[in-house]
């Protein structure tokens, strides 16, 4: 019994004065607590407690279930204890079969012994199966067997407490360990689509998938900058013991423009949190926006190729696309395709391939596209650059020499005089009259220029050159003059092409 200094309150004393007492089943348990300030006896086993206000605890016929810790407490709150084993060969274990463990923590298999003198107190697997190799335990006859550092792999492990009694192995009732996994990473969250574009009145539905080791992961849909509780529907699955998946589906049955915004799927566990967002844009009606990828005014050289390219945004998706020129629809030479294969793609590309363009093929090329809500169009003005062509070169009755040339861009006509037989005409002659004529051809076709000079200025034999040129090239026509007496005659005109 403990000894204390005089004057200080002392713990009660218990008879018999030993820490452990072994009695046989059916025998009497008689425990006496001596203390002037006696309050109560308390009996504890397997988390169950009983009290007795008598200072003598008497159990006439002891049973195995009377095994446990008997504590006497006085008015000062001081106490003393004795542990009683009631030896019963037919009931070697007291058991509480409820067995839970947390991963990486210790857990107690509650199977205290009724006889401390049995040997080899340990754990065994059910049905003769071995225990996991890494399972470590510490036996305590008064409490049970402590499994150290529970592993996830021990979940639903079936086991018995075991002792050797008179050379034979005796097993307790079965226990099945239920393990709660430790969260060692944040939940994995993903969303069905990163962005949604809807028309007013359409249904918005988005699904967040949450994956974790346990169903106790918390998840919710939140609207950014809003506290409103959103309506969610759930579907969940256990793919084995520690592979849990939940789908949280958020639905707005009839979306409005003011529902537009960012929605966040948030999940957390004891390790940390994770989130993923999706953007909703609700428009009052559909739209088409066209973006030319080249300038809408196009200059191309005669015989060359050009691609007219547009990108366009269309929502809802485009239903009809066409390219038109001179009120005629192209049936081929063009292609239309989505900018990306992404499910939420609203951007498309259309390309018209014009090959070996002729001077007569300039004009307005129009791309038209429509969906169920709107139509849209864009026009390209295509100009075909052509080298000048001299259409006419004549000596008029009034003595004028006239040269008419066509080309694009608008040709310039210069006049030169070559005296005698010289090949090079260097002396320039100023025209009397220059006019740009209206072409009878299509718009964007060649421009026609007429230029005249007065032939009376020429007093000697020679050649007059009419040279028409632009950025693309040049062409010349020639007038030959010969004087017979006082008469001037025009000899046949001819043209030369100078590249």
């Amino acid at each position: 019994q403990p000894s204390v200094s005089p004057g200080e309150p002392s713990p009660p004393s218990i008879h018999p004065g030993k820490s452990d007492l072994i009695v046989r089943v059916g025998d009497e348990i008689r425990l006496l607590c001596t203390d002037p300030g006696f309050v109560k006896w308390t009996f504890e086993i397997l988390d169950e407690t009983n009290e007795n206000k008598q200072n003598e605890w008497i159990t006439e016929k002891a049973e195995a279930t009377n095994t446990g810790k008997y504590t006497c407490t006085n008015k000062h709150g001081l106490s003393n204890s004795i542990y009683v084993f009631v030896r019963d060969p037919a009931k070697l274990f007291l058991v509480d079969r409820s067995l839970y463990g947390k991963e990486d923590n210790d857990t107690l298999v509650r199977c205290p012994l009724t006889d401390p003198e049995v040997t080899n107190y340990s754990l065994k697997g059910c049905q003769g199966k071995p225990l996991p190799k890494d399972l470590r335990f510490i036996p305590d006859p008064k409490a049970g067997i402590m499994i150290k550092s529970v592993k996830r792999a021990y979940h639903r492990l079936c086991l018995h407490c075991s002792v050797d009694q008179e050379g034979k192995s005796v097993l307790s009732e079965k226990f099945i360990l239920k393990v709660r996994p430790a969260f060692k990473a944040v939940p994995v969250v993903s969303v069905s689509k990163a962005s949604y574009l809807l028309r007013e009145g359409e249904e918005f539905t988005v699904t967040c998938t949450i994956k974790d080791v346990s169903s106790s992961v918390y998840s919710t849909w939140k609207r950014e900058n809003s506290q409103t509780k959103l309506q969610e529907k759930y579907n969940s699955w256990h793919h084995g013991d520690f592979n849990y998946e939940r789908q949280a589906t958020l639905t707005i049955s009839s979306a409005r423009v003011n529902d537009s915004g960012v929605f966040m799927c948030y999940a957390n566990n004891t390790f940390g949190s994770a989130n993923v967002t999706t953007t909703l844009e609700v428009v009052d009606k559909g739209f088409i926006n066209i973006f030319p990828m080249i300038n809408t005014t196009v200059f191309v050289n005669d015989g060359e190729n050009v691609d007219l390219i547009v990108e366009y945004e269309a929502f809802p998706k485009p239903e009809h696309q066409q390219w038109i020129y001179m009120n005629r629809t192209f049936t081929d030479k063009w292609e239309d395709y989505p900018k990306s294969e992404n499910e939420s793609n609203i951007r498309y590309v259309s390309e018209l391939h014009l090959t070996r363009l002729k001077g007569t093929e300039g004009g307005t090329y129009t791309f038209l596209v429509s969906n169920s809500d709107v139509n849209a169009a864009i026009a390209f003005n295509v100009y075909v650059n052509t080298k000048p062509e001299i259409l006419t070169y004549d000596r008029l009755v009034n003595g004028m020499l006239q040269c008419v040339a066509a080309g694009f861009p608008e040709p310039t006509i210069d006049w030169y005089f070559c005296p005698g037989t010289e090949q090079r005409c260097s002396a320039s002659v100023l025209p009397v009259d220059v006019q740009t004529l209206n072409s009878s051809g299509p718009p964007f076709g060649k421009l026609v220029v007429q230029s005249s000079i007065d032939s009376s200025a020429f007093k000697h034999n020679g050649t007059v050159e009419c040279k028409a040129y632009n950025d693309v090239g040049k062409t010349s026509a020639y007038f030959n003059f010969a004087f017979k007496g006082n008469n001037k005659e025009q000899i046949h005109p001819h043209t030369l092409f100078t590249p």
Epitope: L46, D96, S98, S215
Partner: antibody, heavy 118, light 111 residues
């Protein structure tokens, strides 16, 4: 004696809340996982929610997740089910049940009736 | 979720005769620990359910030995060797391998 007694049921309008209680006696409540199971009129049994012995682990059937909350007070030997945003389809007799060592329900309360009606 | 399907849904039996109820699961209920997480319950008229069989074949405390459970994986059977009048009620199978689900119930009645 060993028993579970539910209370807190009643008639409630859709969208409103109700809290059910389950008082345990005759056993060490804090050592057991506890469940709620319901039974709609004339229908079969449907599991609703579970809570571990210490309150750390909880799970719910998908149809009540986010609306119902299971909790326990081991010092009062009482299990609770907080039911928010109630719907007509939540109308049922609600039973609390104790989970034994083999994860079976070895003890059931007598049930409490919840009627959700406008 | 694992779907539990019971048959028959109604079972009229003469007292003293045997009875058998089948329960099939949409996936195996056999855990790596060797146990089938399949339980049987009886709900007598006007009463709460009571546990009859746990882990596929183990009789619960106080359950008469005329009740027996068998089967493994996805196919399970509850047998009553000789039906008595007090056995009337609805029998449910329940899986506890994953999120708990019940069968739709089999009503046993006396002919």
């Amino acid at each position: 004696q060993v028993q579970l007694v539910e209370s807190g049921g009643g008639v409630v309008q859709p969208g409103r809340s109700l809290r059910l209680s389950c008082a345990a006696s005759g056993f060490t409540f804090s050592r057991y996982g506890m469940h709620w199971v319901r039974q709609a009129p004339g229908k079969g049994l449907e599991w609703v929610a579970v809570i571990w012995y210490d309150g750390t682990n909880k799970d719910y059937t998908d149809s009540v997740r986010g609306r119902f909350t299971i909790s326990r007070d081991n010092s009062k030997n009482t299990l609770y089910l907080q039911m928010n945003s109630l719907r007509a389809e939540d109308t049922a007799v609600y039973y609390c049940a104790r989970e034994d060592w083999a994860e079976a329900f070895d003890m059931w309360g007598q049930g409490t009736t919840v009627t959700v009606s406008s | 979720d694992i779907v539990m399907t019971q048959s028959p849904l109604s079972l009229p039996v003469t007292p003293g005769e045997p009875a058998s109820i089948s329960c099939r699961s949409s996936q195996s209920l056999l855990h790596s620990n060797g146990y089938n997480y399949l339980d049987w319950y009886l709900q007598k008229p006007g009463q709460s359910p009571q546990l009859l069989i746990y882990l596929g074949s183990n009789r619960a405390s106080g359950v008469p030995d005329r009740f027996s459970g068998s089967g493994s994986g996805t196919d399970f059977t509850l047998k009553i060797s000789r039906v008595e009048a007090e056995d009337v009620g609805v029998y449910y199978c329940m899986q506890a391998l994953q999120t708990i689900t019940f069968g739709q119930g089999t009503r046993l009645e006396i002919k």
